[in-house]
Structure formats: C-alpha cells, structure tokens
C-alpha cells in the first residue's frame, strides 16, 4: 500500500478509459460507512466521483455529482439528491454518510451538513467491490461512459464502516481524520488503469 | 519470511537519549507504516507513533511527540525510533511492528530492545 | 485517550476449558479492536482484528466479537500453548491504546 498523504490523482482528459482500482478485502456488507475526499473539476456536466459495484449489481454505492450545487448518493439503485450553493470552479471537500438502520444519508460539503436523506433503510451494501475512481461503473468493474467520466484531480479519501459524528467529519475536513477501515488514503492499494498521473496536492 | 530485526540492549543515564534500530527484511519497506510500541517491566502495552517509510510521514502519540523521533533509512529497509531525556520510567522494552496491509493492527513484530534507564 | 479496560486481569484454568476475556472501551471504537497473545520475554503476536477475523495460521479456538464498546475474545478449548498474556487493542482513534492485558495461568 502506498502513503498517499499530501499527492491527488489527476484525470486530465475526458474518456472512456482512465480510472482507478481502490482495493479492499472488504468481506462482510456494510451497514454503515463514511466516505471523505477532496476534488476539484471544471466539469459543468454530470460525472461520477466514486463508484462501488459488486456482482451482477450496479450503483450499490455511487456518489455522483449531478450539476454544479447537486449531489446524488445511490444505494442499491435507489437515489437522493442534496443540493448546496457553491462557487464554481473550486476545490470542494465531501463526505457522505448512511446508516442502514435508519436509512439517513447525509452530505458534508466544506464541514458543513446538508439537509439530510432517506433511502434503502434497512438494506446492506453488498462486499466485495469493484470501487473506481475516474469513471462510472455499469457492471462490475467496467462498462464505463465517457459522458459520466470525471475530469480532475480527486484526494484525501477515506472510507469507514461506520457513521462518524459531526467532529471526526470536521477533522476529516481540516485534514486530520481517523484511522479508515475500508479506504485509507496514508494506506491505499490501487491500480491505475489509463492516463491517470500522481501529483502533489496543491490547491488545500 | 518477513522479518523485523532489532538492535541490542541498552543502557542510558537519565537526561541522555536512546535510538533503537529495526531492520525489516522479506517484503517491501517502503510500502508499510511502521510502528513503534513500548512496554516498560511487568506492565502493558503502549503506542508511541508511526512512520511511512516512503512518504516519511509520521504520527505521533502526543504523550511522546517532544520526546520520540521516528526517522528510517530506505537503502538499507531500517527504521529508527530515538528518545530524548531520558527517565527512569522510560525503562522499557520498545518494540518496532509492522501495520498490516489492509487493516490498523500489527501483524509482525520485532524482538524488542531493552533500554534501561538507570544513574 | 480511549481506555480499554480488560477484565478478569488474571484468570486460572485448565486445559480443555473454555475461556473468555472481555475488553470495554470508554467511548465507541466500532468495530476496530485488535487481540494480541503474548509470552514472557516474546513480542506480542496477532490473534484478531477487526474484533472479529483470526489472523492467518491462529487456530479455530480463537475467536472474537463485539462492536461498539464491548469485545470479547474466546478460547473454545484452552491448549497447554494458550498460557499467556492477552491484550486487546482498539484503533479506531490515535493515539492506538491497548488493555492492562489478562494473564491465563494453568489452574
């Protein structure tokens, strides 16, 4: 695995092709998670930032950007939406996190809540992904669309199996976040597929 | 096999300071973090701070953060943990433990240093 | 600091018995905990982690369980070998913090 700490992945093109493996011996589904990561796109149209399939089931976890103010989380298929005013172009900061028993989903954009969701309560989030970053999965660790792809540079990710309070999410903003069980950018495994290059994070 | 080797017994006066070796061999150094862990006689277990040999990036524990330097040495797979004004209740034995590839837990070990502290 | 407080810090039995060692942490720790064996004038070896997986080559016998605050860490059959110190482990905050340990002697 590799210390990732201070670095960005950067997708400098449009296609079809560039992505990210993440790697996670991920064994039993998950009831709860936290995902955390930096970005900063250009991109005005809609494109994926993180997609988790499993078998023969896509968009079990799909964190989507749907235009400029308008985050979508899929669970299971199913779909809600957070808006939120933000300057554009601009580094952004996002978490999101759900609970199962619940059904609650909320975005953190820049350390600040979004009004909070509902969807899937009771469902688990199926285990071993195919997690990619730079494009949006439509089976299980392909079938990519050139119009969902991300262009840009994506960091500082981290993902939790379970939902964190309000000041770990702060800390995960203010760059000092907990160890992560699932994702963790000072441990990450993955595999560049594509032209996809390592650069220091310099817009933080 | 994978193997954390580490340097020999020690014996300091109070106020000086200590660095404990430990050499890793079987695997990649430069791809695991790094952890240091104390035990002083007869007691439990404690964490000092980590290191990522490539990165160079580390954590401390704030009880030893002025004290504990972890640095490492790429070309020879050795990682170092120096303690500075040294006590009497730095009396322990350190070890250095490898993280696990995946997961926060230590899955090897090394032999452990003894550092006694004593005027 | 998170405490994790082990109980009993010593315990007496035979072999054959089952065992369990209980470990509390004072604020939730999911599902992160970590149990280590460890034998006089040895380093601690892994036996658990994510309060639940054996580590590779750790015999059936050894099991683990509990999220939140409460784990516990079960011998099914105690063997001559298992007689040693136990330390459970949480790391789901820094700094990483570890129980007292429980001492299994030979009853």
């Known amino acids: 695995h590799t210390d990732l700490s201070g670095k960005v992945f950067v997708f400098p093109r449009e296609s079809v092709t560039d992505h990210v493996n993440l790697i996670t011996p991920l064994e039993k589904p998950l009831q709860n998670f936290t995902l955390c990561f930096r970005a900063y796109s250009d991109l005005s149209r809609a494109y994926s930032l993180f997609s988790y399939n499993t078998q023969g089931r896509d968009n079990e976890l799909l964190v989507y950007k749907e235009r400029v103010g308008e985050y979508s989380l899929y669970i299971g298929r199913h779909k809600v939406t957070s808006k939120v005013i933000e300057k554009f172009p601009a580094p952004v900061h996002i978490c999101v996190s759900w609970e199962s028993s619940s059904g609650i989903a909320e975005f953190w954009i820049n350390g600040t809540p979004l009004v909070k969701k509902g969807l899937r309560q009771g469902y688990f989030v199926e285990a071993q992904p195919k997690i990619v970053l730079g494009q949006e999965q439509d089976s299980y660790g392909g079938k990519f669309d050139r119009s969902q792809s991300f262009v840009g540079e994506i960091g500082d990710l981290y993902m939790w199996d379970s939902v964190l309070p309000p000041e770990n999410i702060l800390s995960a903003y203010q760059g000092t976040p907990l160890p992560a069980n699932i994702l963790d950018w000072q441990a990450l495994n993955y595999e560049i597929r594509g032209y996809v290059i390592i650069k220091p994070l310099v817009w933080v | 096999q994978v193997q954390l080797v580490q340097s020999g017994a020690e014996v300091k006066k109070p106020g000086s300071s200590v660095k404990v070796s430990c050499k890793a061999s079987g695997y990649t150094f430069t791809s695991y973090w790094m952890h240091w862990v104390r035990q002083a006689p007869g007691q439990g277990l404690e964490w000092i701070g980590m290191?990522?040999?490539?990165?160079?990036?580390?954590n401390y524990n704030e009880k030893f953060k002025s004290r504990a330097t972890l640095t490492v040495d790429k070309s020879t797979s050795t990682a170092y943990m120096e303690l500075s004004s040294l006590r009497s209740e730095d009396t322990a034995v350190y070890y250095c433990?490898?993280?696990?590839?995946?997961?926060?837990?230590?899955?090897?070990w090394g032999q452990g240093t003894l550092v006694t502290v004593s005027s | 600091d998170i405490q994790m407080t082990q109980s009993p810090s010593s315990l007496s039995a035979s072999v054959g018995d089952r065992v369990t060692i209980t470990c509390k942490a004072s604020q939730n720790v999911n599902s992160n905990v970590a149990w280590y064996q460890q034998k006089p004038g040895k380093a601690p070896k892994a036996l658990i982690y994510?309060?639940?997986y054996r580590y590779s080559g750790v015999p059936s016998r050894f099991s683990g369980s509990g999220s939140g605050t409460d784990f516990t860490l079960t011998i099914s059959s105690l063997q001559p070998e298992d007689f040693a110190t136990y330390y459970c482990q949480q790391c789901n905050n820094y700094p990483f913090t570890f129980g007292q340990g429980t001492k299994l002697e030979i009853k």
């Open positions: 994510s309060a639940s």
């Open positions: 290191i990522h040999p490539n990165s160079v990036n580390t």
């Open positions: 433990a490898r993280r696990n590839d995946y997961y926060w837990y230590f899955d090897v």
